[in-house]
Interface confidence: medium
Amino acid sequence: EDGGPACYGGFDLYFILDKSGSVLHHWNEIYYFVEQLAHRFISPQLRMSFIVFSTRGTTLMKLTEDREQIRQGLEELQKVLPGGDTYMHEGFERASEQIYYENSQGYRTASVIIALTDGELHEDLFFYSEREANRSRDLGAIVYCVGVKDFNETQLARIADSKDHVFPVNDGFQALQGIIHSILKKSCIEILAAEPSTICAGESFQVVVRGNGFRHARNVDRVLCSFKINDSVTLNEKPFAVEDTYLLCPAPILKEVGMKAALQVSMNDGLSFISSSVIITTTHCSDGS
């Protein structure tokens, strides 16, 4: 890697990419943008899917954390030949199908969608696109939109979670590279550390969860700290404070020495979770220590 910014968050990332006729001469720039971005999400728990849409939506690469499959998926993406109409809603349908399936399998992993389009959507198609984006949201997804060239920012603000979730690229496709840093910063929700990482068995504590993107939730009142204890029971706690780079959370009382709590964060009241490799463990604390 080039030492640029990276994201350590464990969530499901869906790229929904416009491959309609109007991007025919710019597919290389779209591909390169996705490739650069994909390589910056580096958590082993991050899964990725590539979806393309024109007159139909196609899942080019199903959700996977396998880096070899992602490499092959990128190769398939590079071979795409654009053509057809801008049925963006079909892209969201393909994402929602996967989110729904994952939820039904008991995986409540947070989903982030990055949808890229150029040009304004015909009103009939915009109607469907916004509705399908809302369905993805109802399944717990956070939706970002990248608009290139002749896009309608008002439309994209309604398809995305808000106007703050829209990345306008006004200078054409070659300028896509310039927004990689800001997309990464905004779309990345990651848990980096917990302080303290060791707590006393049987005692109540507060934990500072360090990370990024905690205020990217549509509603910060719906942010939860989640503790998966010994890979079985999950306890959700409402944080005392939610800032972009940290959460202040009550830690569950872990009665026995050696117990482990894996830290997760939900941005939507427990509908789905950002996973991490951060573990809180218990130790014996003598009186007065």
């Epitope: 007159t55 109409d85 049925y87 009939d124 198609l125 915009f126 109607f127 469907y128 916004e130 509705r131």
Partner: antibody, heavy 121, light 113 residues
């Protein structure tokens, strides 16, 4: 003026396919979609499917998904539907209609005269 | 699927009187962005194909007499014939086009009392 003229009545045996055509005139064919609706004797209207004459996109009712094929021929401004594996409950008057919007199935502003399909052994 | 329920099933009204037909959808067919209700009304006379009367819940199709009007929003809609004429005897259907599959109401048969 806008006209949709359908092919004549059909009597078919169970399991056979039926193909109905719908010849249009009086408007630009690929500016509007075509939908197919049927009406069993003495019953209400049942939507079967829609095709975009502009890009071939289709949408089907679950009941006929897999049995219904819809096609369009821009050179003759004609839409067709084929329903395979006919059953007795497919006996109905089949209508084609012009759909407002070339992209998405909306309301139906002109209708064909209907084609009666009778399925009987 | 969006289920459309019409009431009453049949209706007898005197000539010159007002006729009111109701249609209820199982979910809202109002789209907030353009404030349009994705609902149409059709008239079907015996032995004829249906004919579009009203679209976007309240817009009259060209050539439709102004005694026909549509109203309502969200899930509840009404077709009103302000002064019934003999030629209005027919079955009337509502239809939603908010989402596929497109669905029709069961129909209301309008007769003269």
């Amino acid at each position: 003026q806008v006209q949709l003229v359908q092919s004549g009545p059909e009597v078919k045996k169970p399991g056979a396919p039926v193909k109905i055509s719908c010849k249009t005139s009086g408007y630009i064919f690929d500016d509007y979609g075509i939908t197919w609706v049927r009406q069993a004797p003495g019953q209400g209207l049942e939507w079967l499917g829609w095709i975009s004459t502009y890009n071939g996109k289709t949408s089907f009712a679950q009941k006929v998904q897999g049995r219904l094929t819809m096609t369009t021929d821009i050179s003759t401004n004609t839409a067709s539907m084929e329903l395979r594996g006919l059953r007795s409950d497919d006996t109905a008057l089949y209508y084609c209609a012009r759909v407002f919007s070339r992209y998405i199935p909306f309301y139906f502003d002109s209708w064909g005269q209907g084609t009666l399909v009778t399925v009987s052994s | 699927d969006v289920v459309m329920t019409q009431s009453p099933d049949s209706l007898a009204v005197s000539l010159g009187e007002r006729a009111t037909i109701n249609c209820k959808s199982s979910q809202s067919v109002l789209y907030s962005y353009n404030n349009k209700n994705y609902l149409a009304w059709y008239q079907q006379k015996p032995g004829q194909p249906p004919k579009l009367l009203i679209y976007w819940a309240s817009t009259r199709e060209s050539g439709v007499p102004d005694r026909f009007s549509g109203s309502g929003s969200g899930t509840d809609f009404t077709l009103t014939i302000s002064s019934l004429q003999a030629e209005d005897v027919a079955v009337y259907y509502c239809q939603q086009y908010y989402s596929t599959p497109l669905t029709f109401g069961g129909g209301t048969k309008l007769e003269i009392k």
